[in-house]
């Protein structure tokens, strides 16, 4: 009696269980009563990442430098190429099909989390006692200078964008 289901790594065809092709190979011909499944390795820039019965291998992803992409991991016959973004850029999606420039944190804001190839810069406002006077994708908020530890006094209070201005004791009003 012909089978209705096959074992793992097999497929049903013409009432017969045939072996699937292993990752990295494509199907050339189905098995018969007398022959095994015929498989062939994928070509140079192709891959198949599962046990399969595909007659064509998939083309490796192209990391287009015009879109800010570069190869993070070269593809094999069993894996696709993994793209990432050039330094200073990050992917616009999980599939990383294109890149955008990392955001900079404006003055008054510091970097909470530096951007990666897949995530943008996360900024946070500088609280009282801290400042950032630059637009940067790397700089955290800096603490105000402690005038006291320098034997000086505050002549002008700091803001979220400026440090305090220290001066000599005798200039105290």
């Amino acid at each position: 009696e012909p089978p209705t289901a096959c074992r793992e790594k097999q497929y049903l065809i013409n009432s017969q269980c045939c072996s699937l092709c292993q990752p990295g190979q494509k199907l050339v011909s189905d098995c018969t009563e007398f022959t095994e499944t015929e498989c062939l390795p994928c070509g140079e820039s192709e891959f198949l990442d599962t046990w399969n019965r595909e007659t064509h291998c998939h083309q490796h992803k192209y990391c287009d430098p015009n879109l800010g992409l570069r190869v993070q991991q070269k593809g094999t016959s069993e894996t696709d190429t993994i793209c990432t973004c050039e330094e200073g850029w990050h992917c616009t999606s999980e599939a990383c099909e294109s890149c955008v420039l990392h955001r900079s944190c404006s003055p008054g804001f510091g970097v909470k989390q530096i951007a990666t190839g897949v995530s943008d810069t996360i900024c946070e406002p500088c609280p009282v006692g801290f400042f950032s006077n630059v637009s940067s994708a790397f700089e955290k908020c800096h603490p105000w200078t402690s005038c006291e530890t320098k034997d000086l006094v505050v002549q002008q209070a700091g803001t979220n964008k400026t440090d305090v201005v220290c001066g000599p004791q005798d200039r105290l009003r």
């Epitope: 510091g110 946070e124 009282v128 006692g129 801290f130 955290k140 105000w144 006094v153 505050v154 002008q156």
Partner: antibody
Framework: QVQLVQSGAEVKKPGSSVKVSCKAS????????IEWIRQAPGQGLEWMGS????????NYNQKFQGRVTITADTSTSTAYMELSSLRSEDTAVYYC???????????????WGQGTLVTVSS | DIQMTQSPSSVSASVGDRVTITCRSS????????????LAWYQQKPGKAPKLLIY???TRESGVPDRFSGSGSGTDFTLTISSLQPEDFATYYC?????????FGQGTKVEIK
């Protein structure tokens, strides 16, 4: 010990100004921020502004649109809050409080004055 | 400006009860550099100036009984009175000191049931 003593109650006409004083003792006046907070009858607390007496640096709540001026006299360890163009809704208790002491980590208000009631009425 | 929202606006409780007051800010009060939350809690009794209870969201001011505790991080904070005492009937305010202008919650009145 830290003490903040405020001037007495005032009754003012709409359109006039009021100047409330806050005399500090028991700490270094020039290096600690003085904060001004008000509370209308039966209402919550509203921050008005602050001053670092030694430098004269100030911060203001923009809500008061230039009606408030905060000053300090380090020779007498006294801070002042002047509110101009008074209207009936400025009727409130006005408090001074001590803010950061120069350490940049004590921005909360750990000592308060007793409050000054300002009544604006025609 | 950072908005502070307290709830409930009033609560009726008995001596010995556990009372919880919540405060929510419109932006995070947690600063990543020092991992501190820029939030304070105050107690105010009628006709008196407010009194500092808690700062940095969870640090008790010296002299404040340990039945008062503060917790929370980011935008959600709680003041808990573990066992209400007669002298605790008052209005409680949260306040942020992250950036100017400082703002307060609208207050929570703890009344006798």
């Amino acid at each position: 010990q830290v003490q903040l003593v405020q001037s007495g109650a005032e009754v003012k006409k709409p359109g006039s100004s009021v100047k409330v004083s806050c005399k500090a003792s028991g700490y270094t006046f020039s290096t600690s921020w003085i904060e001004w907070i008000r509370q209308a009858p039966g209402q919550g607390l509203e921050w008005m502004g602050s001053i670092l007496p030694g430098s004269g640096s100030t911060n203001y709540n923009q809500k008061f649109q230039g009606r408030v001026t905060i000053t300090a006299d380090t020779s007498t360890s006294t801070a002042y809050m002047e509110l101009s163009s008074l209207r009936s809704e400025d009727t409130a208790v006005y408090y001074c409080a001590r803010g950061d002491d120069g350490s940049y980590v004590r921005w909360y208000f750990d000592h308060w004055g007793q409050g000054t009631l300002v009544t604006v009425s025609s | 400006d950072i908005q502070m929202t307290q709830s409930p606006s009033s609560v009726s409780a008995s001596v010995g009860d556990r009372v919880t007051i919540t405060c929510r800010s419109s932006q995070s009060l947690l600063f990543s550099v020092n991992q501190k939350n820029y939030l304070a809690w105050y107690q105010q009794k009628p006709g008196k100036a407010p009194k500092l209870l808690i700062y940095w969201a969870s640090t008790r001011e010296s002299g404040v009984p340990d039945r008062f505790s503060g917790s929370g991080s980011g935008t959600d904070f709680t003041l808990t009175i573990s066992s209400l005492q007669p002298e605790d009937f008052a209005t409680y305010y949260c306040q942020h000191y992250y950036s100017y202008p400082w703002t307060f919650g609208q207050g929570t009145k703890v009344e006798i049931k």
